[in-house]
Interface confidence: medium
């Protein structure tokens, strides 16, 4: 564009600036060793030191490790960004009893209200369940309409909060390939080596090349390239696409240049422990314990608990979904503790693949 010429000319002869055709303006050239915080930096403050993936730049200008949420009892609340740590919190159904910087050192299961008590305030990631005496003549299981919603997830009854000790060794990682293993055993194994090929044994669509052509000289309109099976995240880092190579997972969406592959549990399984873009632990669609009934609460951060059903009632752990599909089994099924903000219609028929939202972070194999 001829009209751009004067603007472009203002950059020539000024070694500290360059002209960016994409935004049609002069941009400040970050000094060697510094990284622009925006596409077209205007001043030195728009440049910063660069950190390795999974490190952030702290106030003292040091690259500092983002905390890891890979322990089984933690989920990622906010991701690792260039200028702030990842933040972890206790997974749904648990609360933090000993806090740590950007994380929780010790998570406990939410308490179950004892007989004659009802939930006053449901448990959250930060606070335990608060109970209050039930009104006379009201069944503890249905003291309020909120307590009679369809179930979201559940925990085993606890007389008092139960700690989950921080995982050691490989317990902080995801399940390994092999459908014959017990889910609990598998939960401590790894999914993918960082140097392994695409999870499904075929090349994924090139995640690094953008539709744009190679850079014009001096242009800022260059998208960073990532190797196959990696995608460019919001922080401009090449991040590994999750692997769906475990026997209990299927690929929902492929690895793209700017988004991860997403995996879900294969039909007939339900996600018991979610992970970013995947599921850390899929278990076969469960059978309900005859002597329990779920006590639902708010879905997002809170969790349900099991308690004895009121006398003369039959526990119904498998309500018909809102879309009218018949449940997978007519026998009562016990709701799982599902670490997600999933659809409120739970359980899900075995014929439907389970897609649960991401809250945890998969850990790449150490090689």
């Amino acid at each position: 564009f001829p009209q751009d010429r004067p603007f472009e000319d203002t950059c020539h002869g000024n070694p500290s600036h360059y002209y960016d055709k994409a935004v049609r303006r002069c941009c400040y050239r970050c000094p060697m060793g510094l990284f622009p915080t925006q596409q077209c930096p205007q001043r030195p403050t728009d440049c910063r030191k660069q950190c390795e993936p999974d490190y952030y730049l702290d106030e003292a200008d040091r690259c500092t490790a983002c905390v890891t949420c890979s322990r089984d009892d933690l989920v990622e609340k906010t991701p690792c960004a260039w200028n702030s740590s990842r933040v972890c919190e206790c997974r749904p159904g648990m609360f933090c009893s000993t806090s740590a910087v950007n994380s929780c050192a010790r998570c406990f299961f939410h308490s179950v209200c004892p007989a004659g008590m009802i939930v006053k305030f449901p448990g959250t990631a930060q606070k335990n369940t608060v109970c209050e005496p039930a009104s006379p003549g009201v069944s503890p299981a249905c003291a309020s309409p909120e307590n009679c919603k369809e179930p979201s997830s559940g925990t085993i009854p606890q007389a008092k909060p139960t700690p989950v000790s921080p995982a050691t060794s490989s317990a902080s990682t995801m399940p390994v390939r092999g459908g014959t293993r017990l889910a609990q055993e598998a939960a401590s194994k790894l999914t993918r080596a960082p140097d392994s090929p695409s999870s499904v044994g075929r090349p994924s669509s090139d995640p690094g090349l953008s539709p744009t052509q190679p850079c014009p000289e001096g242009s800022g309109d260059c998208r960073k390239q990532c190797e196959p099976d990696y995608y460019l995240d919001e922080a401009g880092r090449c991040t590994a696409c999750v692997s769906c190579s475990r026997d209990d997972l299927v690929e929902k969406t492929p690895c793209a240049w700017n988004s991860s592959r997403t995996c879900e549990c294969r039909p007939g399984m339900i996600c018991a422990t979610s992970a970013t873009n995947s599921c850390a632990r899929c278990v076969p669609y469960p059978i309900c314990a005859a002597e329990t009934v779920t006590k639902p609460q708010d879905m997002a951060e809170k969790d349900t608990t099991f308690e004895a059903p009121p006398l003369g009632t039959q526990p119904d752990c498998n309500p018909t979904p809102e879309n009218g599909e018949a449940p997978a089994s007519t026998s009562p099924t016990q709701s799982l503790l599902v670490d997600s903000q999933a659809s409120k219609t739970l359980p899900i028929p075995t014929s439907a693949p389970v897609a649960l939202s991401s809250t945890g972070k998969p850990v790449l194999d150490a090689g």
Epitope: D54, Y55, A65, V101
Partner: antibody
């Protein structure tokens, strides 16, 4: 499997420079930043700095800023470290190191080391 | 810079003993601590990271623990092949720093 093959021992005079290499294989070279670590005889380990082979970006331990220069050649999957103005204090084994993964997993893969001896 | 202090330069032990090596950081490193084993003439070998996560292929007799500024590496039953130099390292923030090392020797 991941391998980091370092160049052979160097004997240098005070004031001179040496340039050592670290050839990476078994993984995509540009995916992982390459770190360098110094170990003086009978002493501990010191982190020198790292390079992002994909972009050439470097960051150094303040202590080594005027001593070490890190570079990388993507075409040969090789990282280099040049040490300048050598003194007897620079006599040490130098390792190139790669992380195991990016979950804060630290130095899982080490080269065999390059011994630098500085003497008149 | 964060200073990592290994107070014991040497530790004497016998095969089959339980031994604990300690490391203290000059500030809270949020469990971002790794442990390495180095034998004479060899490169260091990663054992533990994030204070307690065992690296691939490391025997389960090696256990790491700790939080804040205090960290330990425990070998539950020392084997002959465990006699080596052990370093702690903070992988919390740059510049990454190591302890001075603890040499495990036979009594």
């Amino acid at each position: 499997q991941v391998q980091l093959q370092q160049s052979g021992a160097e004997l240098a005079k005070p004031g001179a420079s040496v340039k050592m290499s670290c050839k990476a294989s078994g993984y995509t070279f540009t995916t992982y930043w390459m770190h360098w670590v110094k170990q003086r005889p009978g002493q501990g380990l010191e982190w020198i700095g790292y390079i992002n082979p994909s972009t050439g970006y470097t960051d150094y331990n303040e202590k080594f800023k005027d001593k070490a220069t890190l570079t990388a050649d993507k075409s040969s999957s090789t990282a280099y470290m040049q040490l300048s103005s050598l003194t007897s204090e620079d006599s040490a084994v130098y390792y190139c190191v790669r992380r195991g993964s990016y979950d804060g997993n630290p130095f899982a893969y080490w080269g065999q080391g390059t011994l630098v001896s500085v003497s008149a | 810079d964060i200073v990592m202090t290994q107070s014991h330069k040497f530790m004497s032990t016998s095969v089959g003993d339980r031994v604990t090596i300690t490391c203290k950081a000059s500030q809270d490193v949020s469990t971002a601590v790794a442990w390495y084993q180095q034998k004479p003439g060899h490169s260091p070998k990663l054992l533990i990271y994030w204070a307690s996560t065992r690296h691939t292929g490391v025997p389960d007799r090696f256990t790491g623990s700790g939080s804040g500024t205090d960290y330990t590496l425990t070998i539950s039953s020392v084997q002959v092949e465990d006699l080596a130099l052990y370093y702690c390292q903070q992988h919390y923030s740059t510049p990454f720093t190591f302890g001075s090392g603890t040499k495990l020797e036979i009594k």
